[in-house]
Structures are given as structure tokens and as C-alpha cells.
């Protein structure tokens, strides 16, 4: 019996508007009906929560209104989008999946996605 595996891309480049999207996919060892997905940012040895959402299988996942994350779910796959990123937010973003219900609980953690954010150059003033 293998432990739950979570897959996510190694590298993603954020758009010029500071938006990064990636897929978090998990191989479930059980028939979960309630799943929690958390995005964590690891900088040095510090891990902080970026956003989290709980969803019922078959339903959409909903982040809090003030969250910088949005996402959609399809089976054991979650499409995550993080918005409002700046160059200083470049770092390793880890997808954590928890099978919350029914018992038993299972934990799965991805290896992380390195998100690179480049702040856009300000437009030079035009002389007409």
C-alpha cells in the first residue's frame, strides 16, 4: 500500500500581471468526500500559509473572499491560480492535500512549485 502522492510542476513563471497558475494532482488512497487543499510558501526554513480551501468531491472549491487564490477542481486534480504576485513573492509554493472525511484522514504534500515573478518594467514616458 503506497502513501498518497501529490504532483505539481517544478517551475512556473508568473505572467506580467502577477498571476501564476499550476495544477496540483493527488493519488487518493481512500474514497474521500471532503478534501482540503492548502498552498504554502517556503522561504528559507519558514513555511507560511498562502491560502486554503475545502471542497466536497464533485463540487467547486471556494477560497475565502479576500484570498489571493482561486481554483477549480476535477476529480483528483486541482487547478490553482495565485494573483497579485510581485517579484518579492518569488519562491517555492507547496501544495498540501488533506483527505478530511470520511476517516481516516490522509496527508499528502507536493515537492513544491518554484514560482518566478518578474515585476514589469514601467512604461517610459512618450514624447509626442
Amino acid at each position: 500500500c503506497k502513501a498518497m502522492h501529490v504532483a505539481q510542476p517544478a517551475v512556473v513563471l508568473a505572467s506580467s500581471r502577477g498571476i501564476a497558475s499550476f495544477v496540483c494532482e493527488y493519488a487518493s488512497p481512500g474514497k474521500a468526500t471532503e478534501v482540503r487543499v492548502t498552498v504554502l510558501r517556503q522561504a528559507d526554513s519558514q513555511v507560511t500559509e498562502v491560502c486554503a480551501a475545502t471542497y466536497m468531491m464533485g463540487n467547486e472549491l471556494t477560497f475565502l473572499d479576500d484570498s489571493i487564490c482561486t481554483g477549480t477542481s476535477s476529480g483528483n486534480q486541482v487547478n490553482l491560480t495565485i494573483q497579485g504576485l510581485r517579484a518579492m513573492d518569488t519562491g517555492l509554493y507547496i501544495c498540501k492535500v488533506e483527505l478530511m472525511y470520511p476517516p481516516p484522514y490522509y496527508l499528502g504534500i507536493g515537492n513544491g512549485t518554484q514560482i518566478y515573478v518578474i515585476d514589469p518594467e514601467p512604461c517610459p514616458d512618450s514624447d509626442f
Epitope: 502513501a3 498518497m4 498540501k96
Partner: antibody
Framework: QVQLVESGGGVVQPGRSLRLSCAAS????????MHWVRQAPGKGLEWVAV????????HYADSVKGRFTISRDNSKNTLYLQMNSLRAEDTAVYYC????????????WGQGTLVAVSS | DIQMTQSPSSLSASVGDRVTITCRAS??????LNWYQQKPGKAPKLLIY???SLQSGVPSRFSGSGSGTDFTLTISSLQPEDFATYYC?????????FGPGTKVDIK
């Protein structure tokens, strides 16, 4: 800094009830799974129960299922363990512990509170 | 439920000795394995998390290895303050079981 302080332990007769509390401070309480772990005199560590985040999901060890109830009040940063139908084998030091945000390990523990079930 | 076993259950060693404790899970737990040290009358203290990561403030003589079902805690050079009981614990699936412990005492 992170602090966990248990209270509510004491001597109780078999079949009676007791409620333990764990006051947490120094971190965002609602972002963490909170656990109870116990240790009978001269024995090893035994995981008792966990309550997740918003309090909707709880899991228990078979030895306490149906008798113990874990709960939390995120507005008060407090974790509880309601223990009913107590038995002599429930005699132990009870610790609350914070599950880490990444892989759930216990980097923070309370000092422990002793529950003695005796007639 | 996932069962955790530890060996040996106790060992006698001298200051400066290299000590190895093994922990085995009844099924794969990936790297969700933690090691704790406990001294009499005290709460346990985290040493190693995620099988091989050293907890902040823990001396580098402690190290952990393994993945799947077999794990090891090594103390490279035993110090007087290391005489204690050591527990492994899995944080992969409920119930979050502990191993029975390994008591390290003075030879």
C-alpha cells in the same frame, strides 16, 4: 512565542466525567490542527484525538471513541477534551499539542495535566 | 490503522557512543515520520520531522533517515543529556500512532 497551557485535570471516580482545556497563544489558532496525546504512568505516548481548523472534522483513537469529544473555540483560542464514562485505564498525563502547518509534527506541547481515575 | 514498531526497546550505551534506533511502519507513510525525545516528568521534545529534517535548536549529532516503511534515528556521539526515551510517530494518517519507545540509559 507559542504557548499551550492545559488545565482541568484531577482525581475522578470511574464512570464520571471531566473536561480538559488547553489555552493557546502566540499563533493563529484556527490555521492549525490541534491534538490531544496522553501518557499513562510508566507507559509510552498514545495519540488520543485531533480537531482540524474550523472544528468541523475530528478524529479519535479507538480506545476513546464514543466516550471522549474534542472541540475548539477559535474565538477564545482554546482547545477542549470532554471525557465521559471514564475508566481506570484513562489515568494518564494529557498533553495538548499543535500539529505543524506542513507535515503535522508536534513542535509545541503543553506542560501536561494529570487525570487520575480511581474509586 | 498503521502500526509503528521500534527496536531496540532499550539499550545501554556510554558517552561518545554512536547510537542507532530503528522504527518500522506497517505500511508506507512516505516521509511523514517524526522523532521525539522525552525525559521523566517532561513533555516530549521534537528532534526530527519529515524523516530527516532537524528541528531548529536540536544538536547536529541527531540525524534521521528513511522513507516508506523503514526509518532510523542516529545519535553520532552520545552526550550525558541524551539519556532519555525516544519515540517515533507517523503523521500520515489517523490514528497518528507512536512507536512504543526506546529507552537509552547509561552502561
Amino acid at each position: 512565542q507559542v504557548q499551550l497551557v492545559e488545565s482541568g485535570g484531577g482525581v475522578v471516580q470511574p464512570g464520571r466525567s471531566l473536561r480538559l482545556s488547553c489555552a493557546a497563544s502566540g499563533f493563529t489558532f484556527s490555521s492549525y490542527g490541534m491534538h490531544w496525546v496522553r501518557q499513562a504512568p510508566g507507559k509510552g505516548l498514545e495519540w488520543v484525538a485531533v480537531i482540524w481548523y474550523d472544528g468541523n472534522n475530528k478524529h479519535y483513537a479507538d480506545s476513546v471513541k464514543g466516550r471522549f469529544t474534542i472541540s475548539r473555540d477559535n474565538s477564545k483560542n482554546t482547545l477542549y477534551l470532554q471525557m465521559n464514562s471514564l475508566r481506570a485505564e484513562d489515568t494518564a498525563v494529557y498533553y495538548c499539542a499543535r500539529g505543524d502547518i506542513l507535515t503535522g509534527y508536534y513542535s509545541y506541547w503543553g506542560q501536561g495535566t494529570l487525570v487520575a481515575v480511581s474509586s | 490503522d498503521i502500526q509503528m514498531t521500534q527496536s531496540p526497546s532499550s539499550l545501554s550505551a556510554s558517552v561518545g557512543d554512536r547510537v542507532t534506533i530503528t522504527c518500522r511502519a506497517s505500511q508506507s507513510i512516505s516521509s511523514y515520520l517524526n522523532w521525539y525525545q522525552q525525559k521523566p516528568g517532561k513533555a516530549p521534545k521534537l528532534l526530527i520531522y519529515a524523516a530527516s529534517s532537524l528541528q531548529s535548536g536540536v544538536p547536529s549529532r541527531f540525524s534521521g533517515s528513511g522513507s516508506g516503511t523503514d526509518f532510523t534515528l542516529t545519535i553520532s556521539s552520545l552526550q550525558p543529556e541524551d539519556f532519555a526515551t525516544y519515540y517515533c510517530q507517523q503523521s500520515y494518517s489517523t490514528p497518528f500512532t507512536f512507536g512504543p519507545g526506546t529507552k537509552v540509559d547509561i552502561k
